[in-house]
């Protein structure tokens, strides 16, 4: 008889990222025997749903279903038929949904409703669909990049397996930018986090961290960018908007009606004497730069300092893992260079902006152009937010490491929630047997 | 290179089923979406449905129950079923290629197509 | 279900000319929309996919632009071979739907 090989003791986990702007699928995959290790989880598959946040499904929530079959097709497909019944899913929606919670909790809820019926028609172990706070979703951020980077594992090693890694255990800080809200997270160096709102406390294999996060809802990109026109329309003579966000040429018709339909902009509302308003780019970094520092209140401040909006944040410490839009954008933009300083970032944006739209089509064609119209915008913005916002300097510039992936999985939120919500993090460090890491040999 | 090839009766009477086949060559059926859409003198491009790598079926439910796909992937074959045929059933019916691009979101694109089998529905 | 209204439904051009095929959708499709061309008794050729991306060996005088509920098609420098009817298809939704088609002669 033939001998059969035997079955791979792997196990398999599901996670969701329900964003503002697209939903995402991804698959986990570990030894079952080393679950408490660090560092062995890897992602193997991500399916981007097509189509847009689940928050935009309010006034159609029949079609949530199909909405997300694809993906979930998928993951039958890539997970073996039979790991299905025990594969955990997940699903966490992150500050779309707070939005229209804040809005609307019937309606959140009946969005998450049939997102939690569609997602249980699957073989899988469906676990349940909810929104994450934006603390939650600082913390499992910081969590992921630390635990693909080797940070919380006790061996040291006279090489390196992981980019970045600087063979010491000082966590990076977690900087997370998404389409409706930001997250910046980090250990601060012997520094009192004076507001509770902002500190964590986590003991993760044998060690205790005390963490600093925050998380600022409509300050994600899509949003802000939503903020500033609501602000800049404000002042305008007539429905023609000339922006320097947008490139040159590029025109734009926004109907105010959608500008005003997020809570983001209700601070910048007013009535309008038109329906419609076109956006004309004029192309310049400056005067957008100087457009989008209106965003940040820097007035106020009720602790020893603050980040923005009266937020308490303490001096920057360590290095910073910078992913989700911050890499997006940067890696567009083709800055994600260790090598290229602020400066340099600050001229090619300049040039950036300036460019012409005709031609930014021709240079870029194949590259969507609702993306391809914004990069003027968020890359601006980025600059923006960590220089003034967190107050990044020329000189701590070259401590953000823009990180699109580690180890092959994507820098997110979404392992780290899993790692957590499947025990897989242990308060204490695990009992080494003798070959648990002779990989290393 | 990539091929795919309908065949099909070309003559079905009004209320029978209409069966299609698609040879693929070029290409494996595990990798791939294999979409059906067809051309009739009514309604111009319609999409009918496909069936994905791993098997899974997604309908227009314009066809409601009257629909089905499945394949044999040993053979590299797909096939369309339709019944209750109507004479505005007539027209060309087409099997394509769609590659999913699961990281970008991107579905649906028919990047290669059959040659069609053209169907009259006629008593 | 999403309709797709093409315009004008068919045009007359000049060898050389510039063409433009305008396709609009009922609602936003983000960028999720392809563009086909069709010639008689032939099946009918991807040509843009994606809004504005041109699949391989297309000839680069075919160009897309455009997303959300507004898309075209442009041919610079029309040759004989462009002669066709070309279709717009989003695949945003099901069920994929398409637009009804221009036929595109020469003058």
């Known amino acids: 008889t033939q001998n059969k090989a035997l079955p791979e003791n792997v196990k398999y986990g599901i996670v969701l990222d329900a964003g503002s702007s697209h939903t995402s699928l991804y698959i986990y995959k570990w030894p079952a025997e080393k679950e408490n290790d660090t560092g062995v989880v890897h992602q193997v598959e991500e399916c981007r749903v097509k189509g847009p946040g689940i928050s935009k499904f309010v006034q159609k929530v029949n079609e949530i279903g199909i909405y997300l079959t694809d993906c979930m097709e998928r993951a039958r497909e890539v997970i073996p038929r039979s790991q299905h019944q025990e594969t955990p899913v997940y699903l966490g929606a992150t500050a779309g949904m707070r939005l229209l919670r804040m809005e609307s909790e019937e309606l959140a809820d009946r969005v998450l409703d049939v997102v939690e019926r569609s997602l249980s028609n699957y073989p899988f172990d469906f676990q349940g669909a909810r929104i994450i706070t934006g603390q939650e979703e600082g913390a499992y951020g910081w969590i992921t990049i630390n635990y693909l980077l080797g940070k919380f594992s006790q061996k040291t090693r006279w090489f390196s397996i992981v980019p970045y890694e600087t063979n010491n255990q000082e966590t990076f800080g977690a900087l997370d930018l998404g389409g409706a809200s930001t997250q910046v997270t980090f250990v601060p160096q012997n520094q009192t986090i004076e507001s509770p709102d902002n500190a964590l406390q986590f003991r993760l294999y044998g060690k205790d961290y005390n963490v600093y996060t925050h998380s600022f809802l409509c300050y994600g990109k899509d949003q802000a960018l939503w903020q500033k026109l609501a602000k800049d329309i404000q002042v305008a003579s007539n429905e023609i908007l000339r922006d320097p966000c947008f490139h040159p040429g590029y025109k734009k018709v926004v109907n105010v009606s959608d500008l005003y339909k997020t809570p983001c902009t209700k601070r910048f509302e007013m009535t309008l004497p038109f329906q419609q308003f076109e956006i004309q780019g004029i192309g310049n970094y400056q005067q957008c730069h100087q457009s989008i520092l209106e965003l940040f209140n820097t007035s106020y401040c009720p602790y020893s300092q603050c980040a923005f909006n009266g937020i308490f944040l303490p001096p920057l410490q360590g290095d910073f893992g910078a992913f989700s839009a911050f890499y997006f954008v940067m890696k567009f933009l083709n800055l994600t260079s260790e090598k290229v300083s602020q400066e340099k970032v600050t001229e090619m944006m300049k040039k950036f902006c300036a460019q012409p739209w005709e031609e930014i089509k021709t240079s870029y064609a194949g590259v969507k152009e609702k993306y391809l119209s914004e990069y003027c915008f968020s890359g601006t913005y980025i600059l923006s937010l960590l220089l003034q916002g967190y107050h990044f300097t020329a000189d701590s510039w070259e401590h953000i490491h823009f990180i699109g992936k580690i180890q092959g999985s994507d820098a997110g939120w979404t392992l780290g929630y899993m790692l957590n919500l499947t025990n897989m993090i242990p308060a204490e460090q695990p009992l080494s047997t003798p070959l648990s890491h002779s990989t290393y040999v | 290179q990539v091929q795919l090839k309908e065949t099909g009766p070309g003559l079905v009477q009004p209320t029978q089923t209409l069966s299609i086949t698609c040879t693929v060559s070029?290409?494996?059926?595990?990798?791939?979406?294999t979409q059906w859409v067809r051309q009739t003198p009514g309604k111009g491009l319609e999409w009918m449905g496909f069936?994905?790598?791993?098997?899974?079926?997604q309908y227009n439910s314009a066809f409601k129950s009257r629909l089905s796909i499945s394949r044999d992937t040993s053979k590299n074959q797909v096939f369309l079923k339709m019944n209750s045929l109507k004479t505005e059933d007539t027209g060309v019916y087409y099997c394509?290629?769609?590659?999913?691009?699961?990281?970008?979101?991107?579905?649906?694109?028919?990047?290669?197509w059959g040659q069609g089998a053209s169907v009259t529905v006629s008593s | 279900d999403i309709r797709m209204t093409q315009s004008p439904a068919s045009l007359s051009a000049s060898l050389g000319e510039t063409v433009n095929i305008e396709c609009l959708a009922s609602?936003?499709?983000?960028?999720?929309l392809a563009w086909y061309q069709k010639k008689p008794g032939k099946s009918p050729q991807l040509l843009i996919y994606?809004?504005?991306a041109l699949q391989n060996g297309v000839p680069s005088r075919f160009s897309g632009s455009g997303s959300g509920t507004h898309f075209s098609l442009k041919i610079n420098s029309l040759q004989s071979e462009d002669v066709a009817t070309y279709f717009c298809?989003?695949?945003?939704?099901?069920?994929?739907?398409f637009g009804g088609g221009t036929k595109l002669e020469l003058r």
């Open positions: 394509a290629r769609d590659r999913p691009d699961y990281h970008d979101g991107t579905y649906g694109v028919l990047d290669v």
């Open positions: 070029g290409f494996s059926l595990t990798s791939y979406f």
């Open positions: 069936i994905r790598s791993g098997g899974s079926t």
């Open positions: 609602e936003d499709i983000d960028s999720d």
């Open positions: 994606n809004g504005n």
């Open positions: 298809q989003q695949y945003i939704n099901y069920p994929y739907t």
